[in-house]
Interface confidence: medium
């Protein structure tokens, strides 16, 4: 089940055969971004 | 075990300011965004906001112009203010957490227990 | 924004019997949809995270399915317990946006 909310690595974060290019091409505005990154990085 | 607990006034007049704060117990505030969601009487659910432990935040355009959400880290705690008030506004509002396990894969997987606001003359 | 539309709004269904949600999206939200369960005076509960993840401690009588705009919400075998009311809930895009909710009552 789910509950967690740190990213291991960028692979791991990228799921539905995206690529990491087509989430930053879908990701909308400033705040989108900050969001993406800020799990991705594990909010250290 | 984490949990959520919030609190506010419940009885507001229209034109004033509500204020609700949610309190997390027990686990861990970084890491996470941190939710507004309210729910009108007998309707759906609408999302407010969110905020992280930085201060970052995220707003429904519908609510942005009127909806503040803060975070006091010292506390564990964030807040929500919703000005300018009208009956529209009565609502349960919860406060919730947001989970993620993947890019723009994230859910509300700890939820706050309702907190009733009626807006009434 | 991304609309959530669900159907039905209601279900009556007996004990035992399958219960099937359905939520349509307004826009391709890929596999970005999670269900919700919400019984009276309570919270809403997360069941099943990215289309088709069952939630820890969530029962596997329950299941989900589907991608893209339509997306389908299972109950293998209805239990008394489980009368209730259901939600989709798109995270592909802010603002996040429910579906109106699906009501599953007692025949």
């Known amino acids: 089940g789910g509950g967690g909310s740190k990213h291991k690595c960028v692979q791991n974060s990228l799921v539905n055969n995206e690529t990491l290019e087509s989430i930053m091409n879908t990701l909308e505005s400033e705040e989108d971004f900050r969001k993406y990154f800020y799990y991705l990085e594990g909010s250290k | 075990q984490v949990q959520l607990q919030q609190w506010g006034a419940g009885l507001l007049k229209p034109s004033e300011t509500l204020s609700l704060t949610c309190a997390v117990y027990?686990?861990?505030?970084?890491?996470h965004y941190w939710t507004w969601i309210r729910q009108p009487p007998g309707k759906g659910l609408e999302w407010i906001g969110e905020i992280n432990h930085r201060g970052n935040t995220n707003y429904n355009p519908s609510l942005k112009s009127r909806a503040t959400i803060s975070v006091d880290t010292s506390k564990n705690q964030f807040s929500l203010k919703l000005s300018s008030v009208t009956a529209a506004d009565t609502a349960v509002y919860y406060c919730?957490?947001?989970?993620?396990?993947?890019?723009?894969?994230?859910?509300?997987?700890?939820w706050g227990r309702d907190t009733p606001v009626t807006v009434s003359s | 924004d991304i609309q959530m539309t669900q159907s039905p709004s209601s279900l009556s269904a007996s004990v035992g019997d399958r219960g099937t949600v359905t939520c349509r999206a307004s826009q391709n939200i890929r596999t970005y949809l999670n269900w919700y369960q919400q019984k009276p005076g309570k919270a809403p509960k997360l069941l099943i995270y990215?289309?088709?993840s069952l939630q820890s401690g969530v029962p596997s009588r329950f299941s989900g399915s589907g991608s893209g705009t339509d997306f389908t919400l299972t109950i293998s075998s209805l239990q008394p317990e489980d009368f209730a009311t259901y939600y989709c809930?798109?995270?592909?895009?802010?603002?996040?946006?429910f579906g109106q909710g699906t009501k599953v009552e007692i025949k």
């Open positions: 027990g686990g861990s505030f970084s890491g």
């Open positions: 990215a289309a088709s």
């Open positions: 809930q798109q995270s592909y895009g802010t603002p996040y946006t």
């Open positions: 919730a957490r947001e989970g993620s396990l993947a890019a723009r894969l994230w859910f509300f997987d700890l």
